[in-house]
């Protein structure tokens, strides 16, 4: 995989501990859940829950495994090969313009609208216009109708990062 | 003598395409991890690409993935970049770099070459 | 990413004179600083590596020091073929660089 993990802390150097695994670079680099030796010469693994490598790289430290945050589920742990996977919980959603906090959806429509999504961990309510069917711009209304959202939908990762 | 000569470059649409090569000589080409790194007008520098010394593996930032690809022929000792859907911000001398023996970063750049993406 | 910040952007001296750049990593990077000098319209030449290694043909009196977080590139006696653009890079996590030091004839 050649994907780029952006925006991770980094582990704190790694100086091969015994229970860490040794191999050859090859062609050079390191395989996914390994990062290179300062020497270039070995392939020290990454540590299990605490940090991690996802693709082939001359990483010289592995990156620290995310940590999921009060109001997020954890979907799936962090292993040498691929990042913690973390959900917003239900009735709340990450915008991908503030992906640094889950933010409540709304429980309603305001007036003249009518509510044609569900809150998802990744987005709001979606509300539209009776009439001409064009979106809400996604504005808490000041005054809100009775019809309300149903809870978040099953778990599906709002933010992946590995 | 470590030279790297790179060539390709031009004025390209925003959305368009373009190759550009880095010709080695001077060192054994295929023991090499190589790079292309950019310089935008600004004089920002930016890691481009990487590719392992026998071409199998490669790894990009976010940037850039998706739209270029980085791979060489070590028959020829030439070192590549595909680029699509390129961007104004694509804009920038692209110079190809060959990482270090025991030092993990580049050591030896080329000249450059500017590619220009503008309507 | 790894942000280095360095600085000044830009300084005047004269020959002679002891210059120091600085650049400040946003996290822990070790040593795995290194330093290039750029001429205008030619590519950046490595000057240090692993923070304070000089690369080979590098006269001595550039030096590198630093670790962590933070990092100097010091010219003890400016010569003139030293004026020209520096640049810091960290290598620990990918590669990023500062974003250079114009340094110019007083």
């Known amino acids: 995989e050649s994907a780029l993990i952006t925006q991770q802390d980094l582990a704190p150097q790694q100086r091969a501990a015994p229970q860490q695994k040794r191999s050859s670079p090859s062609e050079g680099l390191c395989p996914p859940g390994h990062h290179i030796s300062e020497d270039g010469r070995d392939c020290i693994s990454c540590k299990y829950g605490q940090d991690y490598s996802t693709h082939w790289n001359d990483l010289l430290f592995c990156l620290r495994c995310t940590r999921c945050d009060s109001g997020e589920v954890e979907l799936s742990p962090c292993t040498t090969t691929r990042n913690t996977v973390c959900q917003c919980e239900e009735g709340t959603f990450r915008e991908e313009d503030s992906p640094e906090m889950c933010r409540k959806c709304r429980t309603g429509c305001p007036r003249g609208m009518v509510k044609v999504g569900d809150c998802t961990p990744w987005s709001d309510i979606e509300c539209v216009h009776k009439e001409s069917g064009t979106k809400h711009s996604g504005e808490v209304p000041a005054v809100e109708e009775t019809v309300t959202s149903s809870p978040g939908t099953p778990a599906s990762p709002c933010s992946l990062s590995g | 003598e470590v030279m790297l000569v790179e060539s390709g470059g031009g004025l390209v649409q925003p959305g368009g395409s373009l190759r550009l090569s880095c010709a080695a000589s001077?060192?054994?080409?295929?023991?090499?991890?190589m790079s292309w790194v950019r310089q935008t007008p600004e004089k920002r520098l930016e890691w481009v690409a990487t590719?392992?010394?026998?071409?199998?593996?490669?790894y990009y930032p976010d940037s850039v993935k998706g739209r270029f690809t980085i791979s060489r022929d070590n028959a020829k000792n030439t070192l590549y970049l595909q680029m699509s859907s390129l961007r104004a911000e694509d804009t920038a001398v692209y110079y190809c770099?060959?990482?270090?023996?025991?030092?993990?970063?580049?050591?030896?750049w080329g000249q450059g070459t500017l590619v220009t993406v503008s309507s | 990413d790894i942000v280095m910040t360095q600085s000044p952007s830009s300084l005047s001296a004269s020959v002679g004179d002891r210059v120091t750049i600085t650049c400040k990593a946003s996290?822990?990077?070790?040593?795995?600083v290194a330093w290039y000098q750029q001429k205008p319209g030619k590519a950046p030449k490595l000057l240090i590596y692993?923070?304070?290694t000089r690369h080979t043909g590098v006269p001595d009196r550039f030096t590198g020091s630093g670790s962590g977080t933070d990092f100097t590139l010091t010219i003890s006696s400016l010569q003139p073929e030293d004026f020209a653009d520096y640049f810091c890079?960290?290598?620990?996590?990918?590669?990023?660089f500062g974003g250079g030091t114009k340094v110019e004839i007083k």
């Open positions: 770099a060959r990482r270090g023996d025991s030092m993990i970063t580049t050591d030896y």
């Open positions: 692993w923070a304070s």
């Open positions: 590719i392992s010394s026998g071409g199998s593996y490669t």
């Open positions: 001077g060192f054994t080409f295929s023991s090499y991890v």
């Open positions: 890079q960290q290598y620990s996590s990918y590669r990023t």
């Open positions: 996290q822990d990077v070790g040593t795995a």
